[in-house]
């Protein structure tokens, strides 16, 4: 049966919900899928269900709620129906489904090189997604940076931080690294998508000036 796969709010001002609509092997045709929602802003379940306001903007098998339909103070319940029957249902508040857009504008600077010339430390910086209103406290983002050598498969994860820059220590000189960052709303469990990968190439020692310059 069709099921909700994800509801997501990128910035606490809009949200969208998505569902599966696979071909049902050996089952009768369910008919068109519709999404209905109610704002559960009382303790009773007597409120009317309204149909999805926008089936188009968030892509196929989705419903988009623009800012006119979104409030942080009110819990929502949504249900998928087919032929008049409910096939899936879930309830949430907007703050529970925050998944920020990826951080942007990643860049790096060299901090220092070890005396042996084998390792280097870098500072990675980025910006919050454009639609996350950080200044006003409207969103409080926590960031996770991951990095790896280009030819490796496993990413190394750094502890989550609240700032938009972090030092990465002891990278091997003459290797190329991939760095990526993602964010989540503080105290909420949902990380957003990763940023575009930042490539970090640390030139060999001969390309640096004297080591003393870094100390």
């Amino acid at each position: 049966e069709p099921k909700f796969t994800k509801c997501r709010s990128p910035e606490r001002e809009t949200f969208s919900c998505h569902w599966t609509d696979e071909v049902h092997h050996g089952t009768k045709n369910l008919g068109p899928i519709q999404l209905f929602y109610t704002r559960r802003n009382t303790q009773e379940w007597t409120q009317e269900w309204k149909e999805c306001p926008d089936y188009v903007s968030a892509g196929e098998n989705s419903c988009y709620f623009n800012s006119s339909f979104t409030s942080i103070w009110i819990p929502y319940c949504i249900k998928l129906t087919s032929n008049g029957g409910t096939v899936d249902e879930k309830c949430f508040s907007v703050d529970e489904i925050v998944q920020p857009d990826p951080p942007i504008a990643l860049n790096w600077t060299l901090l220092n090189v070890s005396l042996t010339g084998i390792h280097a430390d870098i500072q990675v910086r980025w910006e919050a997604p454009r639609n996350a209103d950080i200044q006003k406290g409207w969103m409080v983002l926590e960031y996770e940076l991951q990095y790896k050598e280009v030819n490796e498969t496993k990413w190394k994860m750094m502890d989550p931080i609240l700032t938009t820059s972090v030092p990465v220590y002891s990278l091997k000189v003459d290797k190329e690294y991939e760095v990526r960052v993602r964010s989540k709303q503080r105290n909420s469990g949902n990380y957003g998508e990763f940023s575009e990968v930042l490539y970090v190439t640390l030139p060999q020692m001969s390309q640096f000036t004297c080591e003393e310059d870094f100390y």
């Epitope: 559960r40 802003n41 303790q43 942080i72 009110i74 508040s93 406290g137 969103m139 105290n187």
Partner: antibody, heavy 127, light 107 residues
């Protein structure tokens, strides 16, 4: 018993600063948003700011943005309103009030609206 | 910001009268409207939330209703303790706003 108790009000000169406190008890402070609402003498209610201490969210009325800062200390179950660059028009009784956070309606018989209020603290801005 | 236009600003009524106070939102706020009662020198008290839900412990003579962006607080039979100022409030927007208030006085 749910209680909100404000303190920190008083007389301050224009341009001065004051910090109000709102001590909460009898409910899970982290799972609510705390709002400051003020009332100028003989006037109506004006919403000032809120904080959701669990998520760290804050928001401010345009009239105080950039001058007032709301914060919370969950270990003390206390919310604060730091008021800087005070003006004569900030003279008012300041109330703190609770609004349950909708994320927790499953467990708390969620209802909306500011259900508990403090007794208020008077802030007078005058030279 | 969403404006809440409350009317009348004051009214005179007698004990036993039916009293109606209205509030109009400048844009859609769903049913995210509450009504409060305030007496002089006291903090406001929640009466109605979600436009029409009676808050626990509030007498049943108080009721709320919604028609689009128009919201109404009704006191079916005014009692002596009901003489006070009443405020509507929208909490649809993250920037919460109140109506200007309606003072209910004894005729």
């Amino acid at each position: 018993e749910v209680q909100l108790v404000e303190s920190g009000g008083g007389l301050v000169q224009p341009g001065g600063s004051l910090r109000l406190s709102c001590a909460a008890s009898g409910f899970n402070f982290s799972y609510s948003s705390i709002h400051w609402v003020r009332q100028a003498p003989g006037k109506g209610l004006e919403w000032v700011a809120y904080i959701s201490s669990y998520y760290g969210y804050t928001s401010y009325a345009d009239s105080v943005k950039g001058r007032f800062t709301i914060s919370a200390d969950t270990s003390k179950n206390t919310a604060y309103l730091q008021m800087n660059s005070l003006r004569a028009e900030d003279t008012a009784v300041y109330y703190c009030a609770r609004l349950q956070h909708p994320s927790w309606y499953y467990y708390q018989g969620y209802h909306s609206g500011m259900d508990y209020w403090g007794q208020g603290t008077l802030v007078t801005v005058s030279s | 910001d969403i404006q809440m236009t409350q009317s009348p600003s004051s009214l005179s009524a007698s004990v036993g009268d039916r009293v109606t106070i209205t509030c109009r939102a400048s844009q859609s706020v769903s049913s995210a409207v509450a009504w409060y009662q305030q007496k002089p020198g006291k903090a406001p008290k929640l009466l109605i939330y979600s436009a029409s839900s009676l808050y626990s412990g509030v007498p049943s003579r108080f009721s709320g209703s919604r028609s689009g962006t128009d919201f109404t607080l009704t006191i079916s039979s005014l009692q002596p303790e009901d003489f006070a100022t009443y405020y509507c409030q929208q909490y649809w927007s993250s920037l919460i706003t109140f109506g200007q208030g309606t003072k209910v006085e004894i005729k």
